[in-house]
Amino acid sequence: AILGRSETQECLFFNANWERDRTNQTGVEPCYGDKDKRRHCFATWKNISGSIEIVKQGCWLDDINCYDRTDCIEKKDSPEVYFCCCEGNMCNEKFSYFPEMEVTQPTSNPVTPKPP
């Protein structure tokens, strides 16, 4: 491991469509990938009228959008499906939404997912 960088070896796994996709619903996912590349964790969720619905969580392959992010934070303004990624084992257990707005002050909506 390179000093100062969290190496990701496993992530929290969740799949809302586990029956259709023929996977487990929840668990811990070991992260595989080319040895020369970085690995990350991700979380995706929807905000349905203020209610958080997790779509998927798991491992994510080498992506500069995720480099050196210890927390899983979505910064896009009002996406249809929220997505965040991070580095470090199980870093996708918690995820947040901090939209980067140009003029107004950013609002914080931290989310601690509860298993269904």
Epitope: Y32, G33, D34, K37, F42, T44, V55, K56, G58, C59, W60, L61, D62, D63, I64, N65, K76, P79, E80, V81, Y82, F83
Partner: antibody, heavy 115, light 111 residues
Framework: QVQLVQSGAEVKKPGSSVKVSCKAS????????INWVRQAPGQGLEWMGT????????SYAQKFQGRVTITADTSTSTAYMELSSLRSEDTAVYYC????????WGQGTLVTVSS | QSALTQPRSVSGSPGQSVTISCTGT?????????VNWYQQHPGKAPKLMIY???KRPRGVPDRFSGSKSGNTASLTISGLQAEDEADYYC???????????FGGGTKLTVL
């Protein structure tokens, strides 16, 4: 091993649409982006757009905005690129590639637009 | 994003070294370590040779190396071999908040 297998060659009339598929295997489809790139005969590579298969979020090159639609079906590990209002200049080989680094590529799909 | 600028062609004899340049702007090549290099033989799909300016994927010979200075990235091929004759493209990372762009390509001829 990682493989991206694309659909076969297509011949299309000007003004019509084409939909090219890219089936991924050998890795978890929901763990990276799929990018689409095209190459006209004797020309260079041209980036068309990308999709995050997990969120469905897409980004398109300005040149193709409004004419290209990239989708992904996680249940079959397949990405699709649909290009509409075809013209002769769209005759090209269309490639899908895995991840932001384009580390694995499909074999390419030749789309010929001719009246 | 405008295309990255590459020389149309370069050439070298077997055993020699050649360098292919890829010039962008301070907002793309100059700002980030996200330039990649691809090799394409006629009628084949491109192959990733260098990513993140200087990282080499598994299976790529160490004769291929990448570097960057200012707004220009470079691919150096040392100990040139006949099979290195191909088109080479530079390109950027694409995904999330990053949009992709490629150079126009450089034809490498091994004399």
């Amino acid at each position: 091993q990682v493989q991206l297998v694309q659909s076969g060659a297509e011949v299309k009339k000007p003004g019509s649409s084409v939909k090219v598929s890219c089936k991924a295997s050998g890795y978890k489809f929901t763990s990276s982006y799929i990018n689409w790139v095209r190459q006209a005969p004797g020309q260079g590579l041209e980036w068309m757009g990308t999709i995050n298969p997990v969120s469905g979020s897409t980004s398109y090159a300005q040149k193709f905005q409004g004419r290209v639609t990239i989708t992904a079906d996680t249940s079959t590990s397949t990405a699709y690129m649909e290009l509409s209002s075809l013209r002769s200049e769209d005759t090209a080989v269309y490639y899908c590639a895995r991840g932001g680094w384009f580390d694995y590529w499909g074999q390419g799909t030749l789309v010929t637009v001719s009246s | 994003q405008s295309a990255l600028t590459q020389p149309r062609s370069v050439s070298g004899s077997p055993g020699q070294s050649v360098t292919i340049s890829c010039t962008g702007t301070s907002s793309d090549v100059g700002s980030y370590n996200y330039v990649n290099w691809y090799q394409q033989h006629p009628g084949k799909a491109p192959k990733l040779m260098i990513y993140g300016v200087s990282k080499r994927p598994r299976g790529v010979p160490d004769r291929f190396s990448g570097s960057k200075s200012g707004n220009t990235a470079s691919l150096t091929i040392s100990g040139l071999q006949a099979e290195d004759e191909a088109d080479y493209y530079c390109g950027t990372f694409a995904g999330g908040s990053y949009y992709g762009v490629f150079g126009g390509g450089t034809k490498l001829t091994v004399l």
